[in-house]
């Protein structure tokens, strides 16, 4: 018979032969042959593989480094990685939660809508037209553009969400 060019789900092609993949939690020791099945071995302590695979090495569980404010939220198994979270009152810097911050800052162009608490991180909002923020801050709201008119001045440079307007003297008409 013709050697296969594709294999079924949970199989892989090697040496013109379809071999079974190793199940999650196990790594590949040796490929199947015409006469033997694929040989797999369970991952060791602190290791995992989360898919049907042909990996020869299991992945190390993530380390939740207490020096970065991390602690274990869910202990890893042979089929799942460890999930880290931050110590109470701290917030993950990313979805992967690789480090912790007390709270995040709102970038220039954004103001603080709600200051962080122990439970929720800083909530930012874009500065609307007429307001700006030129700093990264965890407490400052968007500031209103300066009103040139109230200073008897005119707008020389328009404001943006990151910059205030620039006021200047009114042009005096020559007699």
């Amino acid at each position: 018979p013709e050697p296969p060019t594709a294999c079924r789900e949970k199989q892989y092609l090697i040496n013109s032969q379809c071999c079974s993949l190793c199940q999650p939690g196990q790594k590949l020791v040796s490929d199947c042959t015409e006469f033997t099945e694929t040989e797999c071995l369970p991952c060791g302590e602190s290791e995992f593989l989360d898919t049907w695979n042909r990996e020869t090495h299991c992945h190390q569980h993530k380390y939740c480094d207490p020096n970065l404010g991390l602690r274990v939220q869910q202990k890893g198994t042979s089929e799942t990685d460890t999930i880290c979270t931050c110590e109470e009152g701290w917030h993950c810097t990313s979805e992967a939660c690789e480090s912790c911050v007390l709270h995040r800052s709102c970038s220039p162009g954004f103001g603080v809508k709600q200051i962080a608490t122990g439970v929720s991180d800083t909530i930012c909002e874009p500065c609307p037209v007429g307001f700006f923020s030129n700093v990264s801050s965890a407490f400052e709201k968007c500031h209103p553009w300066t009103s040139c008119e109230t200073k008897d001045l005119v707008v020389q440079q328009a404001g943006t969400n990151k910059t205030d307007v620039v006021c200047g003297p009114q042009d005096r008409l020559r007699a």
Epitope: N67, L68, G69, C86, E87, W90, S99, C100, V101, L102, H103, R104, S105, V135, S136, S137, A138, F139, E140
Partner: nanobody, 116 residues
């Protein structure tokens, strides 16, 4: 590892005053937004006060408004918290925090105990 160093805590009677300091040996505080945060025994972190990098803007939690004053002296590379009219509920470990507020900058804090 660079850490912030808080000092100035101690035992004070209700109605008394204390001035906390936060120093940063090894790096500059100038231009960075700074916070004072506290943790009362058995409680979570409470954000007390903040000051902008320029020193022009400040924030105070409602619980300390009118009693606490945050300030900075960039020439001395130090942040301060002047605490007046202290109450029993101000008892806590006080920490300072520097933008970007990462855990590895976190200091040991300074304990403030308000008791008669």
């Amino acid at each position: 590892e660079v850490q912030l160093l808080e000092s100035g805590g101690g035992l004070v009677q209700p109605g008394g005053s204390l001035r906390l300091s936060c120093a940063a040996p090894g790096f500059t505080l100038a231009g960075y937004e700074m916070w004072w945060v506290r943790q009362a025994p058995g409680k979570g972190l409470e954000r007390v006060s903040a000051i902008s990098g320029s020193g022009g803007s400040t924030y105070y939690a409602d619980s300390v408004k009118g009693r606490f004053t945050i300030s900075r002296d960039d020439s001395k590379n130090t942040l301060y918290l002047q605490m007046n009219s202290l109450r029993a509920e101000d008892t806590a470990v006080y920490y300072c925090a520097k933008e970007p507020y990462s855990f590895d900058y976190w200091g040991q804090g300074t304990l403030v105990t308000v008791s008669s």
